[in-house]
């Protein structure tokens, strides 16, 4: 039943070309190259991809042809290293080309940039987009893959193919519609938002594998799949976890062809064995490949089997606990996690992992004690505070969200997090706090039983964004500590941070608070970001400012923007009223 055992192939590139087909092969190679060389122009990447594809075809025709036996890393790395401007564009990344595989690929991976210096994607007019789509559909879709991949160097490649398929469908449908914009724009907005969420979720998977190792990822997968497939047996879940780990290890490692191929195999296996996995897979398994894989990844939790026995019997009350633990520690802990998770779809995965870690620590201590059973008898009592902490936090924050609404809830989080880690750059604080604030509208609407898995696992994804952005230019020991000590305790670590008393307030700079008439033409979202940027800067200048003081200044600021955007001479209004606002704000905050 090993899904991924294939006969050895003389030519790996020919094997993947045949398995994936030309269209997917080309798309995946483009994604791979764009994720590695994020600054290269589109045309250069297309040229490289075409060269690789032509070479692959020669290998399909004759697997013994020259260089066809080389590994994909060797072939792709050699191709990337032919880029003429590598040293000028990428600096020290060019040194990777002096290395041999596998070190060369590792070097490329280390140079992936989570926050590349690229212009914001501006959406052209609908008619312009439709014309471009009709003129050259293939180039139009390739450009989409390229632009997403270079901005999201860890985007889950087979899932990006699914997004591209939906992107194509949106244009195919809407460019023929009577009201093109009304049809197309909501679809593009949805794809953009889902894409960002998908990218962030995959970034956490890659961080988990790369920073905390395979064991950490597998533990996460055991917990999540056991919640999703509670009727599946432990051996079945373990098998799925192994295969899923291989898929994500490959994608996170830049092995996108292998990853896409193995993901397809895994979807096939799941659908062939759905009777022993989940009753919820039927609809997913009737879909075409890309939709099928996506659907399986998002499938709702199956119903829990009736009459599951108490966990305590096997894991606390039994005299055999230490013996079973000693027989195969990780298998026993895996079984504990599986049994706990399948009974608790109402818990977040990170909470389940904290419980498993507590259980492991207890057994390590107690199985070496004089009376092991007496020592571990109360282990489930230790779980109570661990469960209550996220429950209480979610309850409080959902109440706050319902009271304030999303924008003001984001602002409350902006203030809270700026006070915790004021050294972090303002754009990062704004981006992360805005995303943290979205937990309200995303999760607080759910009933109690779904709130914690929604909220805390979402927060893990958002805090990972903070961690990867901070890792690029570390400025705060507190952020580093919370990000690196424990993957599952990141959120509690950040929650526990108090105001940073060691922080020396930023010098006041009037330029930071000088606004111009261009703010009036911004979308509501962009205007919010401007105001939230100002709020972060205010807190950095005056970390001891009270909520009331900050609220007063922000209210004045909103009134000032509204007033000047209605004025005939907007620029003069912003200049004159802006000076007054800055003076009034300084006085109000005692700056």
């Amino acid at each position: 039943r090993g899904v991924f055992r294939r006969d050895a192939h003389k030519s790996e590139v020919a094997h993947r070309f045949k398995d994936l087909g030309e269209e997917n092969f080309k798309a995946l190679v483009l994604i791979a190259f764009a994720q590695y060389l994020q600054q290269c122009p589109f045309e250069d990447h297309v040229k490289l991809v075409n060269e690789v594809t032509e070479f692959a075809k020669t290998c399909v025709a004759d697997e013994s042809a020259e260089n066809c036996d080389k590994s994909l890393h060797t072939l792709f790395g050699d191709k990337l290293c032919t880029v003429a401007t590598l040293r000028e564009t990428y600096g020290e990344m060019a040194d990777c080309c002096a290395k041999q595989e596998p070190e060369r690929n590792e070097c490329f991976l280390q140079h992936k940039d989570d926050n590349p210096n690229l212009p914001r994607l501006v959406r052209p007019e609908v008619d312009v987009m439709c014309t471009a789509f009709h003129d050259n559909e293939e180039t139009f879709l390739k450009k989409y893959l390229y632009e997403i991949a270079r901005r999201h160097p860890y985007f889950y490649a087979p899932e990006l193919l699914f997004f591209a398929k939906r992107y194509k469908a949106a244009f195919t449908e809407c460019c023929q519609a009577a009201d093109k914009a009304a049809c197309l724009l909501p679809k593009l907005d949805e794809l953009r938002d889902e894409g960002k969420a998908s990218s962030a979720k995959q970034r956490l998977k890659c961080a988990s594998l790369q920073k905390f190792g395979e064991r950490a990822f597998k533990a996460w997968a055991v917990a999540r799949l056991s919640q999703r497939f509670p009727k599946a047996e432990f051996a079945e879940v373990s098998k799925l976890v192994t295969d899923l780990t291989k898929v994500h290890t490959e994608c996170c490692h830049g092995d996108l062809l292998e990853c896409a191929d193995d993901r397809a195999d895994l979807a096939k296996y799941i659908c062939e064995n759905q009777d022993s996995i989940s009753s919820k897979l039927k609809e997913c398994c009737e879909k075409p490949l890309l939709e099928k894989s996506h659907c399986i990844a998002e499938v709702e939790n199956d119903e829990m089997p009736a009459d599951l026995p108490s966990l305590a019997a096997d894991f606390v009350e039994s005299k055999d606990v230490c013996k079973n633990y000693a027989e195969a520690k990780d298998v026993f802990l895996g079984m504990f996690l599986y049994e706990y998770a399948r009974r608790h779809p109402d818990y977040s995965v990170v909470l389940l992992l904290r419980l498993a870690k507590t259980y492991e620590t207890t057994l390590e201590k107690c199985c070496a004690a004089a009376d092991p059973h007496e020592c571990y008898a109360k282990v489930f009592d230790e779980f109570k505070p661990l469960v209550e902490e996220p429950q209480n936090l979610i309850k409080q924050n959902c109440e706050l969200f319902e009271q304030l609404g999303e924008y003001k809830f984001q602002n409350a989080l902006l203030v809270r997090y700026t006070k915790k880690v004021p050294q972090v750059s303002t754009p990062t604080l704004v981006e992360v706090s805005r995303n943290l604030g979205k937990v309200g509208s995303k999760c607080c609407k759910h009933p109690e039983a779904k709130r914690m898995p929604c909220a805390e696992d979402y927060l893990s994804v958002v805090l990972n964004q903070l961690c990867v952005l901070h890792e690029k230019t570390p400025v705060s020991d507190r952020v580093t500590k919370c990000c690196t000590e424990s993957l599952v305790n990141r959120r509690p670590c950040f929650s526990a941070l108090e105001v940073d008393e060691t922080y020396v307030p930023k010098e006041f700079n009037a330029e930071t608070f000088t606004f111009h008439a261009d703010i009036c033409t911004l979308s509501e979202k962009e205007r919010q970001i401007k105001k939230q940027t100002a709020l972060v800067e205010l807190v950095k200048h005056k970390p001891k400012a009270t909520k009331e003081q900050l609220k007063a200044v922000m209210d004045d600021f909103a009134a000032f923007v509204e007033k000047c955007c209605k004025a005939d001479d907007k620029e003069t209004c912003f200049a004159e009223e802006g000076k007054k606002l800055v003076a009034a704000s300084q006085a109000a905050l005692g700056l």
């Epitope: 395979e214 373990s238 098998k239 976890v241 192994t242 000693a326 195969a328 990780d330 298998v331 070496a368």
Partner: antibody
Framework: EVQLVQSGAEVKKPGESPKISCKGS????????IGWVRQMPGEGLEWMGI????????RYSPSFEGQVTISADKSISTAYLQWSSLKASDTAMYYC????????????WGQGTLVTVSS | QSALTQPASVSGSPGQSITISCSGI?????????VSWYQQYPGKAPKLIIY???KRPSGVSNRFSGSKSGNTASLTISGLQADDEAEYSC???????????FGGGTQLTVL
């Protein structure tokens, strides 16, 4: 320091039922599985069976089931391997190992006991 | 009959790298990386050199490394030395309430 010390070599006749021993020291004997391994002359290693001295739970490989008995006396931190009826083909080196983390991982081994069966 | 399959012998010259394979690992052993490797000199007890597929006990040279792909584990010895000449055996977890299994052993000859 963890040590497993095995009893000395045995020369036996077919049909006899010797008992060889493995004494553990330097660790909590009751908390680790002990495994017995056979190595016939010029051959590879074979797991025979394992025992958890804490409660004497014992498991045997199918090919050794009924041929040997594994036991332990936790009061003296000693595990035993006994034959029901020796055959010439039982001539081999026998090792005990402390199993750590999983029953396939012997992190400490005894020096081995050579059992020779000859009529 | 071993449940795990190893080549009977491999050889290499000093300074070279060699790899010994061990196929037939169970799904559960694979999932939890429960594969160990042992080195044994003639007349001596086996010595654990790799556990959990890739980990080395303290004191074992970093020339010894382990890996796994699918249901096959591998032991690689780089920079071969004369005293690496020995028998190498893999062992794997065989499931709950079961005894572990060994491979048939591989004799390494340093030429």
């Amino acid at each position: 320091e963890v040590q497993l010390v095995q009893s000395g070599a045995e020369v036996k006749k077919p049909g006899e039922s010797p008992k060889i021993s493995c004494k553990g020291s330097g660790y909590s004997f009751t908390n680790y599985w002990i495994g017995w391994v056979r190595q016939m002359p010029g051959e590879g290693l074979e797991w025979m069976g394992i025992i958890y001295p804490g409660d004497s739970d014992t498991r045997y490989s199918p090919s050794f089931e009924g041929q040997v008995t594994i036991s332990a006396d936790k009061s003296i931190s000693t595990a035993y391997l006994q034959w029901s009826s020796l055959k010439a083909s039982d001539t081999a080196m026998y090792y005990c190992a402390r199993l750590h983390g999983v029953v396939s991982r012997g992190d400490y081994w005894g020096q081995g006991t050579l059992v020779t069966v000859s009529s | 009959q071993s449940a795990l399959t190893q080549p009977a012998s491999v050889s290499g010259s000093p300074g070279q790298s060699i790899t010994i394979s061990c196929s037939g690992i169970s799904s559960l052993a694979g999932s939890y990386n429960l594969v160990s490797w042992y080195q044994q000199y003639p007349g001596k007890a086996p010595k654990l050199i790799i556990y959990e597929v890739t980990k080395r006990p303290s004191g074992v040279s970093n020339r010894f490394s382990g890996s796994k792909s699918g249901n096959t584990a591998s032991l690689t010895i780089s920079g071969l030395q004369a005293d690496d000449e020995a028998e190498y055996s893999c062992s794997s977890y065989a499931g709950r309430n079961a005894v572990a299994v060994f491979g048939g052993g591989t004799q390494l000859t340093v030429l």
